[in-house]
Each structure stands twice: as C-alpha cells, then as structure tokens.
C-alpha cells in the first residue's frame, strides 16, 4: 500500500525553541516514522533536519539547528515504513518573522504596601532576540487574589514597582513581553502571587518635590513623625531600562545623608545633565521605613521650566488667553520640547475668590465673566509626566477689563 504524505504541518517558534507538529495522513497504518529535510534560500540541495529524523510521534524539535533567524527556509516531510511517501513541502518562512516571544521570567519582592517586579526574558542569551534584547517592554495584569478585579499596566521595563497596595494581602500577576519595533506581543508568564508584609511601623516619606534656589537644588518631602533622620539616594533613570541589570546601584546624595529635617539642599553641580530617580527613607534609630515612591528628576526641566507668557483678548463675557513660550533674557523664546499643561487662575480685581482652569491647549477661553469688570489672570506650567511632577512658578498677574455688554461675538 502506498504511504500518504503527512499533512497540515505547523511550525511553532517560541524564543529559540523550534517545534514542528503535523497530522498523520493514515491512522490505520502502524509503525510509521517521519523525517524532515530543510533548504535554505538560494540553495538547491535539501539537507536532513537534525532532531527530526525517523520520528515516531507527530512532533519534533529542531532547536539545535543553528539557523540564521533572518533567512528564509523551506521544510519538507515524508512518511516512512518499508517504503516512503512522497514529500510534502511546507510553505517557506523566516524564523524571526514567525517567532513568538516566550513567557518572561518574573521575580517578586514584597513590602507592606508595594511589590517590586523584576522581569527578564524567558530565554537567556536568546539567539532569536539577540539584536532586540534592549527593546523589550513588558505589560502586566495584576489583581487581588480575593477579588479578581484586574488592573493592566502597560509599557514597563525590567524592574517595576507597584505602590499603594494593602498590607497583608495576596496579589497575583502575570507578565508578557513585547517588541514594539517588530509588532510582536509575547505569551503571558505563569501567574505569580505574593503576599504584602504586615504594615511597617514607619511609613515611607511622601510628596517629594525638587525646586531650584540660586545654585542649589532643594529637595522637600512630608513625614508623619518628628525626630527622624532621612537619607536620599539617586539613580540614573536609564538604568531601569537595562534588562540584564538586577543590581541597581543607588547612590547617596552626600548633603542628604542622615538629615534631621524634611528637606535637604545640595549644589546643582552634584548632578550632570540628565534624568535621575530620587528616593527618600526615614529612620528613627531603631526602625527604618521602606523607600518612598521614586520620583523622576530631569535637570533640564528642573532648571528651565519657566512660567508661561500669555496675551489676553478681552470680550464682554470672556477672556481669550493665548499662551506662548516663555522668554529668556534677551527676549528669545525658550523651546520646551516636553508636553505641558497650563494652570490658569483668575479673579475679579475687587475680590479674593479665585477660579482655576487646567488646559493642555495654548488657547484658552475663560468664560462667564461680567462686562466692564477688571479681572486678573496668572498662569503656571506643569509637566504632564506624573513622575516628573514639576511645576513652574506663577507668571506675574495681568489685569484686564472686560468689554461692554454687546461685544461677546
């Protein structure tokens, strides 16, 4: 009896694992084995596919074959008993294009109200992703074990910390990788669960802010208790993106080590131009708090987030405000190439009651004004990145009178 060729061959590639699956064409014929050949682009000859010769099952692994993952290859399969079937050719494919990103490795650390997630590629020193290893981003789904309500967090790097959790609570999460440059989304990791610790005696410092005074940075934070000492550490922000890095070498700010106030002052030249992360820890001599939430600190923005400049066009019942770039000395506009939101405060000149508008646009309408009334306006800029959390000082107030009642159009 003639053997039929196997059919429906599927190639599954996850990271560096190459798996072939196929269907037997004739279930009634026993003791059949299967063999594959492969052919590289531009070659005429077929080569035996090692790991996939004389296979009795309908699955084989050819991960040991050292292929150029960017080069197209073609496969063929046949069945063998006393005789052989004809070859069945599989559509040619490029391994890299076909490959899926496997589940990442996940390691969790617990604090009382936070979880630290360390993520690394599932396959160490992967050949498939050798050129893309630095481009991995991750997303995760996290939920309280007791409730199952899921929260998604996108675009995180190899270390991520989730804050504002409840003590002594089990949280579960799963993580997947993505290579946005290649439009690839990976497979979720297994679910990992961890229980946050009992509440720490000392809470971490909160509301960390950096401002500039003269040639110094002033770092301020809030703390619940008195008679504490604090230390402040910094880290280059880009190090968080380094996938091979499990040790973050946070450094002390010398003038902010063992300070007894909820602020410290240090010279601007401590930091070269760049983006840093800052964190603060409290201690009472016996106990130490967990570290505060990390804030992002950009020396450029810190030094140069200037108040906005604006013009007012007065109507009878509204102001139209046009916000422009702030001016440096010499009247040249400052290019601020990061997204800002504007906070506009206005009030009737004869009153203290302030009203506020928050706008992303640079042309803003202040509505519901009374005709022939003097109103004053001041504005400031905020960075839109929640981690930078930087604000300019307010501009000087500008006061204008609204037009008479019939000029609202």
């Amino acid at each position: 009896k003639n053997l039929k060729s196997p059919q429906k061959v599927e190639v599954d590639i996850i990271d560096d694992n190459f798996i072939l699956r196929w269907n037997r064409s004739d279930e009634s014929v026993g003791n059949v084995t299967f063999s594959f050949d492969y052919q590289k682009t531009g070659m005429d000859n077929w080569i035996k596919l090692s790991g996939c010769q004389n296979i009795t099952s309908t699955k084989c692994n050819f991960s040991s074959l050292k292929l150029n993952v960017y080069e197209e290859i073609k496969l063929r399969i046949r069945a063998e008993k006393e005789n052989t079937s004809s070859w069945y050719e599989v559509d040619s494919f490029t391994p890299f294009r076909k490959a899926q990103i496997g589940p990442p490795e996940v390691h969790l650390e617990a604090e009382d109200k936070a979880i630290v997630i360390h993520i690394s590629p599932g396959t160490k020193d992967s050949v498939m992703w050798a050129l893309d290893g630095l481009s991995f981003t991750y997303s995760l789904v996290i939920w309280k074990n007791s409730s199952g309500v899921e929260e998604r967090i996108e675009n995180i790097y190899s270390r991520h910390k989730i804050y504002k959790l409840s003590p002594e609570t089990t949280y579960c999460l799963k993580v997947k990788a993505a290579l946005l440059t290649s439009w690839k989304i990976g497979v979720y990791s297994p679910v990992h669960c961890i229980k946050t610790t009992v509440e720490n005696e000392l809470p971490p410092p909160e509301n960390i802010e950096v401002s500039v005074q003269n040639q110094n940075y002033v770092l301020k934070w809030d703390y619940t208790y008195a008679n504490m000492t604090f230390q402040v550490q910094w880290l280059h922000a880009f190090l968080k993106r380094n996938p091979g890095n499990h040790l973050y070498k946070w450094k002390q700010i010398p003038d902010c080590e063992n300070v007894k106030t909820t602020q410290c002052v240090f010279p601007q030249n401590v930091f070269q131009k760049g983006i840093y992360l800052l964190r603060v820890q409290a201690s009472d001599g016996n106990n130490t708090s967990f570290w505060s939430e990390e804030i992002k600190f950009d020396t450029e923005i810190q030094a140069f987030l200037l108040p906005p400049v604006f013009n007012i066009r007065s109507l009878s019942d509204s102001f139209h405000i046009y916000i422009g770039a702030p001016k440096q000395s010499g009247n040249t506009p400052v290019i601020q190439d990061y997204p800002l939101i504007y906070e506009i405060i206005f009030w009737e000149n004869t009153s203290n009651a302030e009203r506020k508008i928050i706008e992303k646009k640079t042309d803003v309408t202040v509505p519901n004004l009374k005709p022939l009334t003097v109103y004053c306006v001041k504005a400031r800029a905020h960075t839109m990145d929640e981690k930078l959390n930087k604000s300019s000082v307010f501009s000087d107030a500008v006061c204008e009178k609204t037009k008479p009642g019939n000029t609202s159009k």
Partner: antibody, heavy 118, light 107 residues
Framework: QVQLVQSGAEVKKPGASVKLSCKGS????????IHWVKQAPGQGLEWIGR????????KYAPKFQGRATITADTSISTAYLELSRLRSDDTVVYYC???????????WGQGTLVTVSS | DIQMTQSPSSLSTSVGDRVTVTCKTS??????VAWYQQKPGKAPKPLIY???YRYSGVPSRFSGSGSGTDFTLTISSVQPEDFATYYC?????????FGPGTKLDIK
Amino acid sequence: QVQLVQSGAEVKKPGASVKLSCKGSGFNIKDYYIHWVKQAPGQGLEWIGRIDPEDAETKYAPKFQGRATITADTSISTAYLELSRLRSDDTVVYYCGRYHGYWALDYWGQGTLVTVSS
Amino acid sequence: DIQMTQSPSSLSTSVGDRVTVTCKTSQNVGTNVAWYQQKPGKAPKPLIYSTSYRYSGVPSRFSGSGSGTDFTLTISSVQPEDFATYYCHQYFSYPYTFGPGTKLDIK
C-alpha cells in the same frame, strides 16, 4: 564560570595590619558589590562591609568602621580588605562574596584564615 | 542594626524527616532574606534568596517562606548531605546581619 578566589592564610602579630584579596572571574566586577564577612572559629557569620568597585563607594558595619578598609582594583578584578591594629580576637576566617541585588550573596570565596598571635 | 534570631539553635534529626528552621528579624525587612548552608571548613553555600527563591542547582526539598519579620526554611525530607549549619541573612538595610545559625545533626 563565576569564581571568587581569595588569598592564602596569614599569620600576624597583634597591632599589625593585614591586607586580604579576593579575585573575581567569569563576571565583570564593576557590575556587582563585593562584600566581606568574618567568621570566628565555631561562631556565626558577621558582616564587615562592602564596596562598589565601579566607583569605590563603601559601607561598613559600625563595629568595623575605622579599622577595616575595603578597596578594589577593577583592572585586575580584585577587591581587598585591610584590617589594622590586629588583636587576638581577629583570628578568624574572612570571606568575600558577590552581591547581586535581590539575589543577595550568590557567590562566595573559599575564605582566608588570619591568625593573630604573638 | 536589625537583630536576627534563629530557632532552634541546634536540631537532631534523621534522614527522611521534615525540618523547619525559623528566623525572626527585629523589624520589617520585606522579603529581603536569604538562607545559606555551611559545612565545617567550607564557605557558606547559597540556598534561598528573596525569602522563597531557590538558587540554581539547589534541590527542591529546600524551600523558604515568610515575609516582614518571620521567615522559615524547610527541608521536606532531610538527606545525609544536609547535615550542616544554616544561617539566615537580611539584606534590607545596612549594616547587613546574619542569624546566629541552626546546627542540624544526625539523631
């Protein structure tokens, strides 16, 4: 493979100093911290301090501050522990260990026995 | 400094027994605890890091659990090569500290 190889046993007189070495191989010493731990005969482990070989930043246990000095030479992948004003209770084994963030001390040297005797 | 206590200080057991060693810290250290095994004349051998993760090559009979101030090392079925001293270690804040050790010997 990753290894930490420590210098050989030392015999010193009280009041003298000793400098021990710990050579790393199979990894870049600049990417880690190197810690030093002491162990008296039949006793437990006691942390002395650590160095960041990349910039020579050090931390010490208060007990050893001023008497222990940890240094590193990244060009030869080696960290050092120098102990001054040796006393007879410094007759212990000193271990170096590689610190790898949440992996803690994942590799240790074989230990160096220092004997202080007059 | 963070103080660490370990119990028991010594334990006589037989091959095949299940053994539990506990470690208490004087303050919350999150999950920053490691466990090491040491045999006479040898360097400590890393067993568990970050409270519950086994180092590569460590047999699955060793497991760690706990968080905050209370930590446990469990050997599910003691083997002849497990008779040694076990130390816990906190690496939450400086100065780092070790527990006094638990000596496991043959009954």
